[in-house]
Every structure is written in structure tokens, then in C-alpha cells.
């Protein structure tokens, strides 16, 4: 996970085949970054993790280095966004990915207040592209489903991020297994719930069929 | 356990005036935004105002618009629902809820009748 | 103001059936789409919100899909319990509205 203080083009790149990305405002030409409380507009060049952004299930919006999700908090919609715990139902945590716009419920969209902390508001004002890839729009990197392997939810999808031993994962990890297999939860708490399964890994040559897959009798 | 109770519902004449009222408990209130919603008798269910944690968002359905003044109380985890130039179309049972884009908990609900 | 549509008004069904409730909105509302039961004499309460995430403790036979402007409400197998009536709400503009409802009622 670490990530250069500075994040270079090539990075960038290898963090987008990842479905990882750089939130940009496309008129602004500054990138969105989390803070402590706040989001803020940035000069994209200082590009660290708190301003990787990555979509994950339910139509989460995930930031790496703050692990945390944008949400919309219910007591006061137009306050400055910030990040909440992925599970948590105080506020509202989908978001909509439309032509280089990011809308929640009741209209409010994404957008950037006069001071440039990062607002929910229902001016459409703002379009967000992904930094480094030429203008590339950020909903190219929606979230896919990755249904699992074994496990003991029955092929349930994934769902990202998971807390497991008090972090979040929006990947799949092989932490906690002896035998390197990638898995991931099911549902948000791995620890709670328990609900788990193995991860296709296209990547593994040395695993070999049987041990993931069940044989035809 | 979380609970919202009204209270305040009743017989009034048309024009009249009315103020409803609902105590949240079991929950930090102040991070809730509120809303009345209305059940008149044959009809569906109709969204009457609806009020932000720290108040500074407020919003009203068109039928109540310019009569109706949804308020609330954070120190006393109340909220509140004036209504004034009531009509015979207000009757209904009141309901409070909170959430603010969708209704997660719901009150019993109060019945306004207004008649003659 | 967005207008919501549900179908049918009325719907016959005897316990351990399958069912499923529709609602049109006039116009796109994404997924911004809440599903309600109500049963006689008591408050409504909220099964599925975003159009297909069931909330808490309600009964995993309750499922919900859709996008746009066409959602479902399915119910997989009828349950004594469950006869009332249905609403959707939309919450993707700020006039919040109600489908005007689909009777559920023992055949």
C-alpha cells in the first residue's frame, strides 16, 4: 500500500489498471483531498494517498489513504463532505457517477465552495476527471462486482472495503491465511460477521484447480 | 430503545390552527434530519416538510407551502410541526420520521381532523 | 414534481406465493427509490432503500430492483405477516413523493 509522497505519471497509471484514481476538477485543474474533518481542492502535483479515490460496492466512493468513504451526512447536506466509516447509516454513502458528474440523493452533486473545501450542493457547476489520464472521466472505474470462490457465503460478490484486524481492505488480501490465497469478506466486518470467501486470482499459476474449484463426480 | 411519539393532534374548524409535536428518545437527535408525513383517509401517504440536525435546510412540500412551519428543539430532542389556514384536505394522521432522503423511523402518528 | 406510479392498485395473493409490485416514475431518479409496508393501525416502516438494499432486520424475502424510472418490490414467499399496503417513495429531487400505494390482500 505505500504510496510515493509524490505520486509520479507512471504511478498514476499503475494505480488506474487498478481502478485507483486521482479526482480532478476538470475546470479548476485541482484534485480532491481528504483531510481529518475536510475535503479540500489541492494542486494535483503534490498527488499522495489521501487524494487516491477508488469506487467500491454499493456505489461507494473509497479514499485509500484515509480509509474512509465520501458520505452525505443527513443532519446538514450542505456542510463540507467529508469521510465516514463505509458502514455507517448516518449518513448517505452512494454516490452516481454520470457524465464526469457526482450526484447523490435529492439532487446534491459534488461541487466546491469558495474557501475550496469539497461541498454537496445542487449546483451543477463542477466536473470531476481522473488526473494523469488525459481527461479520462472518473466513472470509467466504477465498481464491478467479484463474486467469490468456497468460502461460506455461496459466491456472494466481495464487498469493498471489509474491515479486517482493524483495517480496511478495498482489495483483496491475503492476510491471515498461512496458505497465500487471496479471499475477502462478504459483508463489511469480516470479524462480526464472519463471512468470507476465496478470491479468483487470474494472476496464481502455482494454485492448482482442485484447490479452489470443486471437481465435477 | 430509539422511539418518536406525537403529540398535539385534534378536532379544529377550517382556518384554524394547530401546532404538532414529536419526542425522540434513544437516539443523538442532532444527527437526524426530521419530517412530517401525512396519511389523509382513502389516500397514500403524502410528504408534508422536512428539517436538517442543525436546521439550516428546511423544505416543504407545494400543498403546505406559506402555512405549515416545521421547526425543532436539539436541546429536547423535539420536534415540532406549526400549522395554520388548516383545511378540510389536511385532515389526516401525522406522522414524524426521521432520515433525511428516506424514512427509517417512523411515530405512531396523530390525527388532525379539520371540520366544521 | 415527480409523480410515481405503482401497479397494481390492488393485489390478490395467498400466503407462500411469490409477488411482485411495481413503480414507475416519471422521470429518471436513478436509484434514489424507497420501498414502505404499512399494515392497519400502525406506522409504516421501510423495507428497501436505494432502490435494492434491504434495511435492517427486515426479512431477507423481501428484495428490490431497478434504476431510472422502472422499480420491482418482490416478495419471494408470502408470509401471514406481510399483507398491507406498499409504498415507494422517490428522493432524487427535494419534493419528496409517494407512490399512491398497492393493496397486498389475502386471495
Known amino acids: 500500500e505505500g504510496v510515493a509522497a509524490a505520486l509520479t505519471p507512471e504511478r498514476l497509471l499503475e494505480w488506474q489498471d487498478k481502478g485507483i484514481f486521482v479526482i480532478q476538477s476538470e475546470s479548476l485543474k485541482k484534485c480532491i483531498q481528504a483531510g481529518k474533518s475536510v475535503l479540500t481542492l489541492e494542486n494535483c502535483k503534490q498527488a499522495n494517498k489521501h487524494m487516491l479515490w477508488k469506487w467500491v460496492s454499493n456505489h461507494g466512493l473509497f479514499n485509500i489513504g484515509g480509509s474512509g468513504c465520501l458520505g452525505l451526512n443527513f443532519s446538514a447536506p450542505e456542510q463540507p463532505l467529508s469521510l465516514y466509516e463505509c458502514d455507517s447509516t448516518l449518513v448517505s454513502l452512494r454516490w452516481r457517477c454520470n457524465r464526469k458528474m457526482i450526484t447523490g440523493p435529492l439532487q446534491y452533486s459534488v461541487q466546491v465552495a469558495h474557501d475550496n473545501t469539497v461541498v454537496a450542493s445542487r449546483k451543477y457547476i463542477h466536473k470531476w476527471i481522473s488526473y494523469g489520464s488525459g481527461g479520462g472521466d472518473i466513472c470509467e472505474y466504477l465498481h464491478k462486482d467479484l463474486h467469490t470462490i468456497k468460502g461460506n457465503t455461496h459466491g456472494m460478490p466481495c464487498m469493498f472495503p471489509f474491515q479486517y484486524n482493524h483495517q480496511w481492505h478495498h482489495e483483496c488480501t491475503r492476510e491471515g491465511r498461512e496458505d497465500d490465497l487471496l479471499w475477502c469478506a462478504t459483508t463489511s466486518r469480516y470479524e462480526r460477521d464472519e463471512k468470507w470467501g476465496f478470491c479468483p486470482d487470474p494472476t496464481s499459476a502455482e494454485v492448482g484447480c482442485d484447490t479452489i474449484w470443486e471437481k465435477d463426480l | 430503545e430509539v422511539q418518536l411519539l406525537e403529540s398535539g393532534g385534534g378536532l379544529v374548524k377550517p382556518g384554524g390552527s394547530l401546532r404538532l409535536s414529536c419526542a425522540a428518545s434513544?437516539?443523538?437527535?442532532?444527527?437526524?434530519?426530521m419530517n412530517w408525513v401525512r396519511l389523509a383517509p382513502g389516500k397514500g401517504l403524502e410528504w408534508v416538510a422536512s428539517?436538517?440536525?442543525?436546521?439550516?435546510?428546511?423544505s416543504y412540500a407545494d400543498s403546505v407551502k406559506g402555512r405549515f412551519t416545521i421547526s425543532r428543539d436539539n436541546a429536547n430532542n423535539s420536534l415540532f410541526l406549526q400549522m395554520s389556514s388548516l383545511r378540510a384536505d389536511d385532515t389526516a394522521v401525522y406522522y414524524c420520521s426521521s432520515g433525511y432522503f428516506y424514512f427509517d423511523l417512523w411515530g405512531p402518528g396523530t390525527l388532525v381532523t379539520v371540520s366544521s | 414534481d415527480i409523480q410515481m406510479t405503482q401497479s397494481p392498485s390492488i393485489l390478490s395473493a395467498s400466503v407462500g406465493d411469490r409477488v411482485t409490485l411495481t413503480c414507475r416514475a416519471s422521470?429518471?431518479?436513478?436509484?434514489?427509490l424507497a420501498w414502505y409496508q404499512q399494515t392497519p393501525g400502525k406506522a409504516p416502516r421501510v423495507l428497501i432503500y436505494?432502490?435494492?438494499t434491504l434495511e435492517v432486520g427486515v426479512p431477507s424475502r423481501f428484495s428490490g430492483s431497478g434504476s431510472g424510472t422502472d422499480f420491482t418490490l418482490t416478495i419471494s414467499s408470502l408470509q401471514p405477516e406481510d399483507f398491507g399496503t406498499y409504498f415507494c417513495q422517490q428522493y432524487h429531487t427535494d419534493s419528496r413523493t409517494f407512490g399512491q400505494g398497492t393493496i397486498l390482500e389475502i386471495k
Open positions: 434513544g437516539l443523538i437527535f442532532k444527527n437526524y434530519g
Open positions: 428539517i436538517s440536525g442543525n436546521s439550516n435546510y428546511i
Open positions: 422521470q429518471s431518479i436513478s436509484s434514489w
Open positions: 436505494e432502490a435494492s
